[in-house]
Amino acid sequence: LIQERRSHQNNPAAHLTGANSSLTGSGGPLLWETQLGLAFLRGLDYHDGALVANKAGYYYIYSKVQLGGVGCPLGLASTITHGLYKRTPRYPEELELLVSQQSPCGRATSNSRVWWDSSFLGGVVHLEVGEEVVVRVLDERLVRLRDGTRSYFGAFMV
Amino acid sequence: LIQERRSHQNNPAAHLTGANSSLTGSGGPLLWETQLGLAFLRGLDYHDGALVANKAGYYYIYSKVQLGGVGCPLGLASTITHGLYKRTPRYPEELELLVSQQSPCGRATSNSRVWWDSSFLGGVVHLEVGEEVVVRVLDERLVRLRDGTRSYFGAFMV
Amino acid sequence: LIQERRSHQNNPAAHLTGANSSLTGSGGPLLWETQLGLAFLRGLDYHDGALVANKAGYYYIYSKVQLGGVGCPLGLASTITHGLYKRTPRYPEELELLVSQQSPCGRATSNSRVWWDSSFLGGVVHLEVGEEVVVRVLDERLVRLRDGTRSYFGAFMV
């Protein structure tokens, strides 16, 4: 029983939450809260929006983003892409891991220009020590953050 | 190997399924089937719609609800909120953990009055012994529960 | 620590990805890539679209499918069903495990007839040795595969 408990306590896991500072508008990935409220890191590191593996292995990684808007201004993309991407020293570019495309503006109608939609991604990927995972949303202007419960990012070793 | 198998057998996990009795109409959380069919509890308890932790630690909690309706009698502006909430003796009110908002009525078209949508939530949260997690949907009458495969609620320790 | 690492290395897990050959049009389940790119099998087998358990226990199984189309041709169902199903020698028919219904065509608008939607399923189920899990989508013609990051199927023991 001691062994089993120790195993759980050491198992890498993290849950990061959305915050006002998450949307940078710089073309970079979303940034996340790592300590306050529901957010935590256990056996994983965080750096500039990325979860960083300290231990090689397979991880279930996940992210949810809350999308919302008022109608669909022409300046905004009618397709929203939400993805988890890997950064590794072995490649110069980010590697797509898990991606979703949605057309949420179809939910805005003549009667109701306000719309809400949610995108969830989760899957098992292999990470080497030092490899990073980030979340990107295009167009990030449609991400609604509020209080950390609607948009988040996490992982745990399986 | 014996140690590893024992570890899995003891790891808290649960999967609860929707049933005809899930919608109380009382303003409380959804209720769930805990034994029949695909439903089970292993190292977690159940009480009035809540999964109750018997062991402190980080849990991946998840819920899916199948939403559906015929047209949009409440108006196309209607927003459905699906959330996982924590009950703890340390606070008088439920704490939001993971929440989604959707505007599914935008899916009803002139070609199709009947619409279906699905909301999935999952994330890692910390639970102390005795703390509870419940699922709420507003408006719960738009949740399809009948067969247990379309709306469900579960957790496992990570 | 050696014990803990061994436990992780032996823990059954898999992540299978969509490929050009995934959609058979034969009425069978979706087929998956098991080795290339992000795909892997560890302690689970694969057979004709199915993940096959080598070890009895509870598994978190998941699947995401990327849906997309141009408008809603009358020949296509306005409701799309995405499900995970169990095959077992104990029953002649597949057993529904986790299912979603969506009406994505409502996302096509006057501004943009092209629509995208995504369906994610995940939950804990019990598998005996030799039992299989498959993914089905009706109408599969609306599944968009591309590169393995948008439609996928996986599992790990909990």
Partner: antibody
């Protein structure tokens, strides 16, 4: 248990306006339902006229749309139908019906007994 | 508008018989189909919704099947109270439409 009861004049003159009311008892009109009107000419089949929700959203049969108005009176827990410019072809038994619009249960499960309307001078 | 064609338009059967009525839609309606029973001077009564779901309180002798364009209502063992007119109805798209009806008579 919800019950519906139609009321209104049984005789309407050609080119006049047919006005019917459906009283809802045993439940609130402010629920996730569509409140429908369906008619049945003598010896013939059923024809859907239209629907209204408690929030006043309406959908009408295109074949009648230019002549139909439906509304809801939440205070009185009733809904109504107005059909103008009537002719003999509008002679029928008029039913009000509740259609459930929730996720688990669909269908027009509650009907009024029907009221016969004759268009004649 | 979606047209629903019922067949047969009428049929004669005896108590205890198994009877099948079909309804064909002019385009796909998924499972958004209901079946009603109507007796003279009475309003229609909902029997089946969502193509195959039995309405509460309705005898299990009634069953529905089908999806897309072809649907069936089956009465497994006719009882005296089953002789009536049966209508299918699609609620998938506007306008809601009904089949022309099938009159079930005693042989």
């Amino acid at each position: 248990q919800v019950q519906l009861q139609e009321s209104g004049p049984g005789l309407v003159k050609p080119s006049g306006t047919l006005s019917l009311t459906c009283a809802v008892s045993g439940g609130s009109i402010s629920s996730i339902n569509w409140w429908n009107w369906v008619r049945q000419p003598p010896g013939k089949g059923l024809e859907w006229i239209g629907e209204v929700s408690h929030s006043g959203i309406t959908n009408y049969n295109p074949s009648l749309k230019s002549r139909v108005t439906m509304s809801v009176d939440k205070a009185k827990n009733q809904f109504s139908l107005k059909l103008n410019s009537v002719t003999a072809a509008d002679t029928a038994v008029y039913y009000c019906a509740r259609e459930r619009a929730v996720a688990d249960y669909h269908g027009m499960d509650v009907w009024g007994q029907g009221t016969t309307v004759t268009v004649s001078s | 508008a979606i047209q629903l064609t019922q067949s047969p338009s009428s049929l004669s059967a005896s108590v205890g018989d198994r009877v099948t009525i079909t309804c064909r839609a002019s385009q796909g309606i998924s499972s958004a189909l209901a079946w009603f029973q109507q007796k003279p001077g009475k309003p229609p009564k909902l029997l089946i919704f969502d193509a195959s779901d039995l309405e509460s309180g309705v005898s299990s002798r009634f069953s529905g099947s089908g999806s897309g364009t072809d649907f069936t209502l089956t009465i497994s063992s006719l009882q005296p109270g089953d002789f009536a007119t049966y209508y299918c109805q699609q609620f998938n798209s506007y306008p809601i439409t009904f089949g022309q009806g099938t009159r079930l008579e005693i042989k």
